[in-house]
């Protein structure tokens, strides 16, 4: 089949006339909306068949699909058909009219469907909304077909703007009919309860109108009956719920609760189970280890995290040096406790741009009327090392000394090194480490002081050089867990003038 113009999509002007031609090796016919519009059919001398469809005085209502197919069923590739889609942008036509049955979309399984709201102009922006909502739904739109996706049982409308007026389509109603497969879900208000509290479970079955619920529960083993209540969720068609309520739970009520749902028409069934734990009294339990010594780096933010399990929900307090902490208005401290599962919690203390004063003894206490737990640790603020001073002196004894002073937390290590060949060292040759070597060319004396108020160590190290016969680059490197700092000084022999 050959169609001219070939399409597959044409945009034609309103009020214009347009000619479509289809030709093939057997009789052909144009179809529009399952009908054959008036057309001229002919047979050429070469045996080719054709059909000419003349569209006159086009309006927006001529927008749609046009098919050319073989006109007989003599086995000449009868399934071959050519499709052409024509748009006739027409500001007087909003959405193309639908048959009544197109407004009601019924389905029996979860499958993709199309809401067939179509416009005459492929340039228009069309959005889909729930009938009672303004928010556009994120569903892909095809100007030739409409919105396709998986839809809930709701009412939908399409909207577009033509010129400066907003146009709404008719409402489309999506109905999911009763289906025979059973999908059961079971959930509990709480899966952990204290004895004396209530257990409430819900079993919901979707997609069937008539079902039978059967619960099995630990209490039944003892012949203690629980009467479930069945109701219909009115806002959700074919959602039937069975509620199992046990007042004043006992320890023996711990165990597996199973909801079995049967549907007698097709004899389908499904069951789901959930575990319930009844505890004698509430509990708070730490999960995982938190070291008794924690570190934070000066001026960096640090979050300290404690994970624990508790039931019922606990109160969580943080203390520093036995004083209660709260979220500070200056934003220096943030406290948060998140419920990450029914009984699991994560409590976090965040120190923003840590200061030296925030070092100290921290405690987290989680408690309720039945139990409590606390966790303590020492927070050490780590301060990167700084070399504060590197100086050289010539005592009368003839030796030369270099003094290096620096600070940091934790305690810095000091490394002395020297370059004798100033041209090549340290780029080409490694520096020589200095220290209390056996050759006694150099001697080292190091003193360490802890400054309580600043909560850091000060290191003072003096390097004594016995005889310096040529210029020497002496380097002092301080290093600790959070950084290092280096300074160097040129030491010249006594005899050399500066």
């Amino acid at each position: 089949l050959v169609v001219t113009p070939p399409g597959p999509e044409l945009v034609l002007n309103v009020s214009s006339t347009f000619v479509l031609t289809c030709s093939g090796s057997a009789p052909v016919v144009w179809e529009r909306m399952s009908q054959e519009p008036p057309q001229e059919m002919a047979k050429a001398q070469d045996g080719t068949f054709s059909s000419v469809l003349t569209l006159t005085n086009l309006t927006g209502l001529d927008t749609g699909e046009y098919f050319c197919t073989h006109n007989d069923s003599r086995g000449l590739e009868t399934d071959e058909r050519k499709r052409l889609y024509i748009f006739v942008p027409d500001p007087t036509v909003g959405f193309l009219p639908n048959d009544a049955e197109e407004l009601f979309i019924f389905l029996t399984e979860i499958t993709e469907i199309t809401i067939p709201c179509r416009v005459t102009d492929p340039q228009l922006v069309v959005t889909l909304h729930e009938k009672k909502g303004d928010v556009a739904l994120p569903v892909p739109y095809d100007h030739q077909r409409g919105f396709s996706g998986i839809f809930e049982d709701r009412s939908y409308i399409c909207k577009t703007t033509i010129g400066d007026r907003e146009v709404d389509s008719d409402a489309y109603y999506v109905y999911r009919l009763q289906v025979s497969s059973i999908n059961v879900s079971v959930n509990a208000v709480q899966t952990v309860v204290r004895q004396g509290e209530n257990i409430t479970l819900m079993c919901i079955v979707i997609g069937n109108e008539v079902v039978n619920f059967e619960w099995t529960y630990p209490r039944k083993e003892s012949g203690r009956l629980v009467e479930p209540v069945t109701d219909f969720l009115l806002d959700m068609p074919y959602h039937i719920r069975s509620i199992l309520h046990i007042p004043s739970a006992e320890l023996e009520d711990s165990g597996t609760y199973t909801c079995n749902v049967t549907e007698s028409v097709n004899d389908h069934q499904d069951e789901k189970a959930i575990n319930i734990t009844v505890v004698e009294s509430g509990y708070v339990r730490l999960l995982g280890e938190v070291g008794t010594l924690q570190f934070a780096e000066l001026h960096r933010s640090r979050t300290l995290q404690v994970v624990f399990e508790a039931y019922p929900p606990p109160t969580v307090l943080w203390f520093k040096d036995n004083r209660t902490l709260g979220d500070s208005s200056a934003g220096e401290i943030a406290l948060s406790t998140r419920n990450v599962s029914e009984t699991r919690y994560v409590s976090e203390l965040t120190l923003v741009r840590v200061k030296v004063a925030e070092a100290g003894h921290y405690t987290m206490r989680a408690f309720h009327e039945d139990a409590e737990v606390q966790l303590s640790f020492q927070l050490q603020i780590n301060v990167p090392v700084r070399v504060l001073e590197l100086s050289e002196s010539h005592p009368d004894s003839g030796e030369q000394t270099v003094r290096c002073r620096g600070r940091g937390m934790p305690q810095p290590n000091i490394i002395w090194s020297a370059c004798r060949d100033l041209k090549r060292c340290p780029r080409e040759l490694p520096p020589t480490l200095l220290g209390n070597s056996s050759e006694e060319e150099s001697q080292l004396e190091t003193n360490v002081t802890y400054w309580e108020e600043e909560q850091e160590f000060e290191v003072v190290s003096t390097l004594r050089l016995q005889h310096v016969d040529r210029p020497l680059s002496v380097r002092c490197t301080l290093r600790n867990a959070v950084g290092q700092d280096t300074q160097e000084v040129i030491v010249v022999p006594h005899s050399l003038p500066f």
Epitope: K220, E221, S222, G223, R224, E227, P247, S248
Partner: antibody, heavy 116, light 107 residues
Amino acid sequence: EVQLVESGGGLVQPGSSLKLSCLASGFTFSNYNMYWIRQAPKKGLEWIALIFYDNNNKYYADSVKGRFTISRDNSKNTLYLEMNSLRSEDTAMYYCLRDSGPFSYWGQGTLVTVSS
Amino acid sequence: DIQMTQSPPSLSASLGDKVTINCQAGQNIKKYIAWYQQEPGKVPRLLIRYTSKLESDTPSRFSGSGSGRDYSFSISNVESEDIASYYCLQYDNLPWTFGGGTKLELK
């Protein structure tokens, strides 16, 4: 200690009425479903009625349905069995029971004799 | 109603014998069966629940088994204090129903 004490039994004529009571103690009465069971002389056991803890649901054996009514007063820790249109085959020892470990707690029973 | 057919109605045993009582339910009762002992002039006493779970005061010579519709109750080593009537009870479906009872006597 769980105790169930039945009362109200006696000799009545066929067609007449009787109301049995069962006073419960030693447990939280309002948390438990309660039952009546009977045993005819030299015969077996027959379950006759059940009432749920909250007074909402009641079940009966076919043999007593429409004639007997089970009820409870949780504020008085008391279970009742109102028996109307009594027949000779209702002659039995009537036991009140608490639902745990099916029928693990029994009262001593009260004897109902229906005879002309 | 679920019919419970208990057999035999009576049983003679010598001390030290093993005896077995059977109960057949009219339908699957999913192991929800209990066994009671009733001595003459006394109230029934629960021995076993949920097919095979012995009550805390039930001697270990008593046992229960079964599934679906067929259940049995055994005394492995009959003692004189075991002379009584025994009843099965299905408590899967309301109305709960008892078996007709088995009277155990000494030979």
